[in-house]
């Protein structure tokens, strides 16, 4: 039979040719994409392959050692010369791992027709690959019509005598793939019809999507769909200290490459991400969300002296508020306000002040208006009461001045103006306040609400009262006015700085009406209501009686 | 006012054990860190253990390390140092300090210290 | 771990005059745009007190003629006017990386 290297001769060594290809080939780097794993890969084979030729003299094994001394596998045929060739080669048992679709690729080298000298007629330049899928690793059947064709495969390089000169070898990658595949393993087969072939490597491999890190999710090494077209949805999981609103999805393309990410993983609270991984947030650092990015300095006025904080503690006399977002510093109470100072008109009171000289951090100050009454002689104060009106309100001040209207006249008061915020009511530190003394204007003081009546006589009446309810400052004196019933437009006047009086030179029997207003500096009050007395009859005892309803 | 006074010091044999205690007063003790520091006669400062305020923290120097044990009790503000395995180089004044709260923390409240003494 | 190295070992200034204590880190003790540095004096038969940190900050109640400064792994402490009571050890420590290591010590003496 015809050698690849033009003799006729079937030598047990390799020809020349075989050592160039090799020595070019096989220095061509070994190592696989990451995306695909070999199931077989005779080049990295170290002992026998366990392959077999069918018929024996068919397809031979060149042994061949590379630069470190480890085996070639190489097989080679050339019976270019004689009829209907039909050499099978058979590899061993070949697991697919769990994989549905697998690839074939061929490293061959290939002889051109042309360039053989007689052998046209029977000379063939392409060859046969087949496989027959197995559970059993030792089913191997050389039944051809078990097997089922891949494909024919020509070389897209071959080569001439002229090549062999040159020492320059054309070495042909060949690429096939086979799917679904049902079972455990497979076998593949080489059938030569009569072609000069020499075959170099043949490497079987799946493909997978390696496992991956992305968006801080893990996904697994994924095994490729059957289908060339087809997208393999695959969930992925969070790493150590990290979670998901969204679980994360890739897609696993047929040629291993990840698509379409959805989702994503992110740092819990506490942890940041750094080189794909969740740190622990360091003392003196937190993150309060899954969502912020990185840890952050705790803010003013606060500390955290633990790994992995989710929010700060605050300093000494600082507060946060709930409603407070844990990236906001720290705040106290304010000072008191300052600069107090009031005008008295009448019954009224107009205060302003200027803010706090410290706020204490906070936008959210207000003032609180606290109002005391007290009394001059005694020093004693008491809450002001309801009848009180501030002018716009007692609370929530944000402007710095207040109006106190239907105050009582000529009295004693203590305001007290309070600066608050909203952690006051977290602080368990005194109010902070300014207070302002005033005394209201006198006024006209009120009726006389209380008359008795003390002796009766034929011609004089004697009567008592109190000083009114509300004086509005000190009572000057009081006008008494009375006239007899029913001829109100002769009336008499008296004047009195006491609370008692005698109406002289009455009719006998007469009934007279009496009127009473008390007067201070601001002048005189309203009259009293009507009180009617009558006068004894000519020869009737005086009486003393008590008060009149 | 902030006080940390140390208790526990004594004389012990090598390969002996010895509780330190570390009482504090005057601040909220479960919210801050705190270390133990040592100074062996006529030397320097040597920093021992720290723990967070909630133990989540804990961190030795690598003389201690497998040997000490610190922890503490936020109920009764008071922070331990157990010594197991003691050694003569262990002999030292042991202080307790108080991470401070100004960023980045020092150590801002020493105790008055509580001498140790590792000897046969 | 982070060993911090002081120098001089000892030293002796005159009363009213500038003494100066460096401190060199093995590696960085900055983190963050922060020098995790602290300074530290101590007296005979006292517990250390704590002067300056983060490099540069002084601690509430130490008198201002104490000044630190310096960043990444080298740092200084600078006493401006000498009193009689600064008469002391001085010490830096890291606070960036456990161990919290610290220098070991420089001895001031009023000359």
């Known amino acids: 039979p015809a050698s690849l290297a033009g003799c006729y001769s079937a030598p047990r060594r390799a020809p020349l040719w075989t050592c160039l290809l090799l020595c070019a080939a096989l220095r061509t780097l070994l190592a696989s994409p990451s995306n695909e794993v070999n199931l077989l890969d005779s080049r990295t084979v170290m002992g026998d392959l366990g392959w077999i030729a069918f018929p024996k003299n068919g397809w031979e094994e060149i042994g061949e050692v590379d630069e470190n001394y480890a085996p070639i596998h190489t097989y080679q045929v050339c019976k270019v010369m004689e009829q209907n060739q039909n050499n099978w080669l058979l590899t061993s048992w070949i697991s697919n791992e769990g994989a549905s679709r697998i690839f074939i690729e061929l490293k061959f080298t290939l002889r051109d027709c042309n360039s053989l000298p007689g052998g046209l007629g029977t000379c063939k330049e392409t060859f046969n690959m087949y496989y027959f899928e197995s559970d059993d690793q030792n089913g191997r059947n050389i039944k051809e019509n078990q097997y089922i064709k891949i494909d024919t495969i020509a070389a897209d390089e071959s080569f001439t005598e002229l090549d062999l000169g040159d020492r320059v070898m054309k070495l042909n990658t060949e690429v096939r793939d086979v799917g679904p595949l049902s079972k455990k393993g497979f076998y593949l087969a080489f059938q030569d019809v009569g072609a000069c072939i020499a075959l170099v490597s043949v490497r079987v491999y799946y493909k997978k999507c390696p496992s991956v890190v992305r968006h801080l999710a893990v996904f697994p090494d994924t095994i490729t769909g059957a289908d060339s077209s087809q997208l393999l949805e695959v969930s992925g999981s969070c790493v150590n200290h990290s979670v998901t609103d969204e679980p994360p999805k890739m897609h696993c393309s047929a040629e291993g490459e990840w698509l379409v990410p959805i989702g994503k993983c992110m740092c819990k609270a506490g942890y940041e991400e750094k080189n794909g991984t969740c740190q622990v947030c360091r003392p003196g650092f937190f993150k309060a969300s899954p969502h912020i990015q990185s840890c952050g300095k705790c803010p003013p006025h606060s500390y955290t002296h633990e790994e992995a904080s989710t929010s700060c503690v605050c300093e000494k006399d600082y507060f946060r508020r709930e409603s407070d977002p844990p990236t906001m510093a720290c705040t106290r109470p304010p000072s008191a306000p300052r600069n107090a100072i009031s005008n008295v008109n009448e019954t009224s009171v107009f205060l302003e002040w200027i803010p706090p000289a410290d706020t204490g951090g906070r936008k959210d100050v207000s003032y609180y208006i606290a109002c005391k009454k007290c009394n001059s002689h005694a020093g004693v104060c008491e809450e002001c009461g309801g009848h009180v009106r501030y002018l716009p309100r007692q609370s929530g001040l944000k402007n710095t001045s207040v109006m106190m209207v239907d105050l009582l006249a000529h009295t004693n008061y203590t305001f007290e103006i309070e600066a608050v915020n909203g952690v006051s009511d977290l602080s368990p530190g005194a109010r902070q306040y300014v207070s302002v003394n005033v005394t209201t204007n006198q006024a006209a003081p009120s009726p006389v609400t209380n008359v008795k009546k003390g002796k009766i006589a034929k011609n004089s009446i004697s009567l008592s009262w109190q000083e009114p309810d509300r004086p509005n400052g000190i009572i000057l004196e009081y006008e008494i006015k009375y006239f007899e019933k029913d001829q109100e437009t002769s009336y008499t006047i008296i004047k009195s700085k006491e609370t008692t009086i005698t109406a002289e030179g009455l009719k006998p029997a007469s009934v007279y009406v009496f009127q009473i207003r008390a007067r201070t500096a601001a002048g005189y009050g309203v009259f009293s209501r009507r009180f009617e007395f009558e006068t004894t009859p000519v020869f009737a005892a005086s009486s003393d009686q008590s008060q009149i309803p | 006012e902030v006080q940390l006074v140390e208790s526990g010091g004594g004389l012990v044999q090598p390969g002996g054990s010895l509780k330190l205690s570390c009482a504090a007063s005057?601040?909220?003790?479960?919210?801050?860190?705190i270390h133990w520091v040592r100074q062996a006669p006529g030397k320097g400062l040597e920093w021992v253990a720290y723990?967070?305020?909630?133990?989540?923290?804990?961190y030795y120097a690598d003389s201690v390390k497998g040997r000490f044990t610190i922890s503490r009790d936020n109920s009764k503000n008071t922070l331990y140092l157990q010594m197991n395995s003691l050694r003569a180089e262990d002999t030292a004044v042991y202080y307790c300090?108080?991470?401070?709260?100004?960023?980045?923390?020092?150590?801002?409240?020493w105790g008055q210290g509580t001498l140790v003494t590792v000897s046969s | 771990d982070i060993v911090m190295t002081q120098s001089p070992d000892s030293l002796a200034v005159s009363l009213g005059e500038r003494a100066t204590i460096n401190c060199k880190s093995s590696q960085s003790v900055d983190y963050d745009g922060d020098s995790y540095m602290n300074w530290y004096q101590q007296k005979p038969g006292k517990a250390p007190k704590l002067l300056i940190y983060g490099a540069s900050n002084l601690e509430s109640g130490i008198p201002d003629r104490f000044s630190g400064s310096g960043s990444g792994t080298d740092f200084t402490l600078t006493i401006s006017r000498l009193e009689p009571e600064d008469a002391a050890s001085y010490y830096c420590?890291?606070?960036?990386?456990?161990?919290?290591?610290f220098g070991q010590g420089t001895k001031l003496e009023i000359k």
């Open positions: 300090a108080r991470y401070g709260t100004s960023f980045p923390y020092g150590l801002d409240y």
């Open positions: 420590q890291q606070s960036n990386e456990d161990p919290f290591t």
């Open positions: 723990i967070s305020g909630a133990s989540t923290t804990i």
């Open positions: 005057g601040f909220t003790f479960s919210t801050f860190g």
